[in-house]
């Protein structure tokens, strides 16, 4: 039975040209995390693998920094970066846990962070 929950940074907003940290955390399970994938809609941004380390997709290499922790830092944000982001935790023996973050990139300086929420 999958008992874990993923806490994410929730719905967040940031200014165009700035940067943002996407964070997820898996709790309430003793399952071993073997890999974390970061995806934007259906596009792979980055992978953190226990044995192989970080892999950043070539198309994002200039704008994505690994971390902090198992998170991902997006830099030089554009309005086109607005959308859904997913952290996918591959674990043993539980299987896969997925967290969702919605990022809105704003033209103005009214960017504010939304509340955290949990996905079972």
């Amino acid at each position: 039975m999958m008992t874990g929950t993923i806490e994410t940074t929730g719905n967040i907003s940031a200014e165009k040209g700035g940067s943002i940290i996407l964070q997820c955390h898996l709790s309430s399970t003793t399952a071993q995390v073997t890999q974390v994938n970061w995806e934007q809609q259906d596009q792979l941004l980055a992978i953190c693998n226990a044995d192989l380390g970080w892999h950043i997709s070539p198309s994002f290499k200039d704008r994505v920094a690994p971390g902090p922790g198992l998170g991902l830092t997006l830099q030089s944000l554009t309005v086109n970066d607005t959308g859904e982001y997913f952290c996918i935790y591959h674990t043993y023996p539980d299987g896969t846990y997925t967290g969702r973050i919605f990022l809105e990139v704003l033209e103005s300086s009214v960017a504010e962070h939304g509340a955290r929420f949990q996905i079972p």
């Epitope: 709790s27 226990a50 192989l52 380390g53 892999h55 920094a65």
Partner: antibody, heavy 117, light 107 residues
């Protein structure tokens, strides 16, 4: 297997600089953060900063900004730390360490830096 | 910066005894905590990573627990080889910080 081989001990004059190295083997150098830690005799461990060779990203402990400069040469899988304007307070053993959240850290053997006139 | 408060700073324990060292973070660090063992004139050795995971080659008498702010390292049955200084390290966000260390000696 993962190995981090550090350069040898250094005896340097106050006010000068020193550059120490950490050669990595047994893994893909560009895929992992490589950190540096300071230990003075009788003291604990102090985190200086780290570098991600795959993109050149760096993080520094505010205390070491202006003192330490971290670089990496992906061709030789070697990380470097330059320490500038040396004083007796910089006399210490410096460790490099390959850090990863999901498997724990591997450590170099340490490099002793002695600052003395 | 996140402050890591480690206790005790030193302790004596008997062979076969159960030993627990604690680390408290000044704020929530999730599971981003590691434990290291260091012997004099040696490099630190990773014991526990991601708060609870045993590093390769580390004896099963070592275990880690905790999440959020409170963490502990337990040695279930102390052996003579365990004489060393133990450090916790948070590595969730820069700057990473070590606890002050716990010097463990045999009674």
């Amino acid at each position: 297997q993962v190995q981090l081989q550090q350069s040898g001990a250094e005896l340097v004059r106050p006010g000068t600089s020193v550059k120490i190295s950490c050669k990595a083997s047994g893994y893909t150098f560009t895929n992992f953060w490589l950190g540096w830690v300071k230990q003075r005799p009788g003291h604990g461990l102090e985190w200086i900063g780290d570098i991600f060779p795959g993109g050149g990203h760096t993080n520094y402990n505010e205390k070491f900004k202006g003192k330490a400069t971290l670089t990496a040469d992906t061709a030789s899988s070697t990380a470097y730390m330059q320490l500038s304007s040396l004083t007796s307070e910089d006399s210490a053993v410096y460790f490099c360490s390959r850090s990863t959240i999901l498997t724990g850290a591997y450590w170099g053997q340490g490099t002793l830096v002695t600052v003395s006139a | 910066d996140i402050k890591m408060t480690q206790s005790p700073s030193s302790m004596y324990a008997s062979l076969g005894e159960r030993v627990t060292i604690t680390c408290k973070a000044s704020q929530d660090i999730k599971s981003y905590l590691s434990w290291y063992q260091q012997k004099p004139w040696k490099s630190p050795k990773t014991l526990i990573f991601y708060a609870t995971r045993l590093a390769d080659g580390v004896p099963s008498r070592f275990s880690g627990s905790g999440s959020g702010q409170d963490f502990s390292l337990t040695i279930s049955s102390l052996e003579s080889d365990d004489t060393a200084t133990y450090y916790c390290l948070h590595h969730g966000e820069s700057p990473y910080t070590f606890g002050g260390g716990t010097k463990l000696e045999i009674k």
